[in-house]
């Protein structure tokens, strides 16, 4: 995957197809949620900064047996340059804060939306 350089300030450029698909998958999850997502599983909260894709994957990869987020996990792995395995943690995790997967997904989506509105909305 390329086209990720300068992501923090995209200006008038819309996201790459891969990133667009990630956003759409997060939208699908948040909008189609009926029962508690992943049975209410908890994951480490992360700092939504430059390395957030790897951090998000490191957090979500510890949730197993939840088909609803499997596609998201696969997509995030495409944005993370190194291999991520369960139990792996980076400094981007807020290690004293755990949140529900549903909230984690919502926070990630809101952050991505904010990033793409930067430079467009005053």
């Amino acid at each position: 995957l390329t086209c990720l350089g300068g992501f923090a300030s995209p200006g008038p450029v819309p996201p790459s197809t891969a990133l667009r698909e990630l956003i759409e998958e997060l939208v699908n999850i948040t909008q189609n949620q009926k029962a508690p997502l992943c049975n209410g599983s908890m994951v480490w909260s992360i700092n939504l900064t430059a390395g957030m894709y790897c951090a998000a994957l490191e957090s979500l990869i510890n949730v197993s047996g939840c088909s609803a987020i499997e596609k998201t996990q696969r997509m995030l792995s495409g944005f993370c340059p190194h291999k991520v395995s369960a139990g792996q943690f980076s400094s981007l995790h807020v290690r004293d804060t755990k949140i529900e997967v549903a909230q984690f997904v919502k926070d990630l989506l809101l952050h991505l939306k904010k990033l793409f509105r930067e430079g467009q909305f005053n």
Epitope: P12, V13, P14, V27, R117, F121, N122
Partner: antibody, heavy 119, light 107 residues
Framework: QVQLVQSGAEVKKPGASVKVSCKAS????????IHWVRQAPGQGLEWMGA????????AYNQKFKGRVTMTTDTSTSTAYMELRSLRSDDTAVYYC????????????WGQGTLVTVSS | EIVLTQSPATLSLSPGERATLSCRAS??????LHWYQQKPGQAPRLLIY???QSISGIPARFSGSGSGTDFTLTISSLEPEDFAVYYC?????????FGGGTKVEIK
């Protein structure tokens, strides 16, 4: 179901202002941007600008900058578009529409509000 | 500003015929191009998004293609209710812009 319901038709004199409202229902209001598009009689569609209800951030078409103000009231899930210093060529149907993010399509539209500017 | 040019301005066809509408962008907009249908006295209705993605509830006879600067909306076999004005829209960057429209009228 998703609905965008706009205020009724207005007749204004040149130089006056108009404020059109757009009440949203059937979805989480702050999750979607509200964009405004107008259509003069027998003409095409023209994008006026947009507002992000979550932050209040706006983006205006340069053509309307200084004359248009877009606002939202999240407590009532209502968006507003005010156009000032009206001219006869502002006579048009004004539509509100929602977009998840600016590059997405306009998937739901209000019914339109006819604003007539005449002396 | 991205300028969208639609052609032809008017298309005169009979029910059952195939309609091919063109939209050309003044610069590369990848697949950030959406199509709308508008009937008299009504708000526009979304038909196709991202150049070729179909919308649930929209008949399969409507299809879109293209990428970059050249895009096409095809109606495989015109039904009486398809006679309307069709607009393309740039979703690539602000200001969002629309094509001038193509009116599909009964021959």
């Amino acid at each position: 179901q998703v609905q965008l319901v706009q205020s009724g038709a207005e007749v204004k004199k040149p130089g006056a202002s108009v404020k059109v409202s757009c009440k949203a229902s059937g979805y989480t209001f702050i999750d979607y941007e509200i964009h405004w598009v107008r259509q003069a009689p027998g003409q095409g569609l023209e994008w006026m600008g947009a507002i992000d209800p979550e932050t209040g951030g706006t983006a205006y078409n340069q053509k309307f900058k200084g004359r248009v103000t877009m606002t939202t009231d999240t407590s009532t899930s209502t968006a507003y578009m005010e156009l000032r210093s009206l001219r006869s060529d502002d006579t048009a149907v004004y539509y509100c529409t929602r977009i998840l993010l600016y590059y997405y399509p306009m998937d739901y539209w209000g019914q339109g509000t006819l604003v007539t500017v005449s002396s | 500003e991205i300028v969208l040019t639609q052609s032809p301005a008017t298309l005169s066809l009979s029910p059952g015929e195939r309609a091919t509408l063109s939209c050309r962008a003044s610069q590369n907009i990848s697949d950030y191009l959406h199509w709308y249908q508008q009937k008299p006295g009504q708000a526009p209705r979304l038909l196709i998004y991202y150049a070729s993605q179909s919308i649930s509830g929209i008949p399969a006879r409507f299809s879109g293609s293209g990428s970059g600067t050249d895009f096409t909306l095809t109606i495989s076999s015109l039904e009486p209710e398809d006679f309307a004005v069709y607009y393309c829209q740039n979703g690539h960057s602000f200001p969002l812009t629309f094509g001038g429209g193509t009116k599909v009228e009964i021959k």
